[in-house]
């Protein structure tokens, strides 16, 4: 039985040109995390494998940094980065857990007047 839950930063906003940390946390389970995939819609950004380390998709290697921890740092943000991001936790013996984050990248002037989304 899958008892775990994924906690995420929820809906977040960031300034164009800036950076943001995408974080998920798996709780309420003793399952072993074997791999975490980070995806934007259906596009793979990165994989963190417990034994093999990180794979950053070549398309994003110049502006995606691994970590902190199992999280992912997006740099040099553009308005096109606005959208849904998913953390997909592969665990043993539970199976797969998925968390969702919505990122809105704002023009600098808008971001200066406060984020539209609050982190829960």
């Amino acid at each position: 039985m899958m008892t775990g839950t994924i906690e995420t930063t929820g809906n977040i906003s960031a300034e164009k040109g800036g950076s943001i940390i995408l974080q998920c946390h798996l709780s309420s389970t003793t399952a072993q995390v074997t791999q975490v995939n980070w995806e934007q819609q259906d596009q793979l950004l990165a994989i963190c494998n417990a034994d093999l380390g990180w794979h950053i998709s070549p398309s994003f290697k110049d502006r995606v940094a691994p970590g902190p921890g199992l999280g992912l740092t997006l740099q040099s943000l553009t308005v096109n980065d606005t959208g849904e991001y998913f953390c997909i936790y592969h665990t043993y013996p539970d199976g797969t857990y998925t968390g969702r984050i919505f990122l809105e990248v704002l023009e600098s002037s808008v971001a200066e007047h406060g984020a539209r989304f609050q982190i829960p």
Epitope: T34, Q35, L44, I47, N49, A50, D51, L52, G53, W54, H55, S57, P58, S59, K61, D62, H90, Y92, T96
Partner: antibody, heavy 119, light 107 residues
Framework: EVQLVQSGAEVKKPGASVKVSCKAS????????MHWVRQAPGQGLEWMGR????????KYNEKFKSRVTITVDKLSSTAYMELSSLRSEDTAVYYC????????????WGQGTTVTVSS | DIVMTQSPDSLAVSLGERATINCRVS??????LAWYQQKPGQSPKLLVY???TLAEGVPDRFSGSGSGTDFTLTISSLQAEDVAVYYC?????????FGPGTKVDIK
């Protein structure tokens, strides 16, 4: 066109070391991880390790961990695999292989380097 | 280590007929499986990754299926140039391991 060109065949004595090179071209070297895989005569494929050419960080197969070192030279877009304390069972073709876009598989392979260990 | 087994060890198929190769894995690897083709005297060539995604430039007579622990590579209509050894490989943990290979010949 992606190309991985490896160094020539080597003959080594037991106990010696060998260093095989793999020169990459046709893509941005630092954007793709590099793997090393070997194949003994008439045998299957055996993974040795991988490296991130950007950071230099590497991961090894525990079987080879004490004897293998994978490095890169970013300026020349070249990856290297050094295997020490050679024994006859290390006689094999050694391949470098570029990691794919979507995970830890290999999408392009070098032509292979034959290493013969014989006294 | 994750253990990969392939069946059959070898098979001979008539030109134009279907060839099916199976790969069984000792533990759940989700869909993290690749297939490679190796012709005599050549380097391996990637055919399929993520169990079913065809690599660039690979003819569509090749297809992959399966998830978890059981996977299949199918050649729908065998051509002379498909004579080779085919290897499965998981791409899920350290060490990455390959199956022992399946030799495909023309009957």
């Amino acid at each position: 066109e992606v190309q991985l060109v490896q160094s020539g065949a080597e003959v080594k004595k037991p106990g010696a070391s060998v260093k095989v090179s793999c020169k990459a071209s046709g893509y941005t070297f630092t954007n793709y991880y590099m793997h090393w895989v070997r194949q003994a005569p008439g045998q299957g494929l055996e993974w040795m390790g991988r490296i991130d050419p950007d950071s230099g960080g590497s991961k090894y197969n525990e079987k080879f961990k004490s004897r293998v070192t994978i490095t890169v030279d970013k300026l020349s877009s070249t990856a290297y695999m050094e295997l020490s304390s050679l024994r006859s069972e290390d006689t094999a073709v050694y391949y470098c292989a570029r990691e794919g876009h979507y995970g830890f598989y290999s999408d392009y392979w070098g032509q292979g380097t034959t290493v013969t260990v014989s006294s | 280590d994750i253990v990969m087994t392939q069946s059959p060890d070898s098979l001979a198929v008539s030109l134009g007929e279907r060839a099916t190769i199976n790969c069984r894995v000792s533990e759940n690897i989700y869909s993290y499986l690749a297939w490679y083709q190796q012709k005599p005297g050549q380097s391996p060539k990637l055919l399929v990754y993520n169990a079913k995604t065809l690599a660039e430039g690979v003819p569509d007579r090749f297809s992959g299926s399966g998830s978890g622990t059981d996977f299949t590579l199918t050649i729908s209509s065998l051509q002379a140039e498909d004579v080779a050894v085919y290897y499965c490989q998981h791409h899920y943990g350290n060490p990455l391991t390959f199956g022992p290979g399946t030799k495909v010949d023309i009957k």
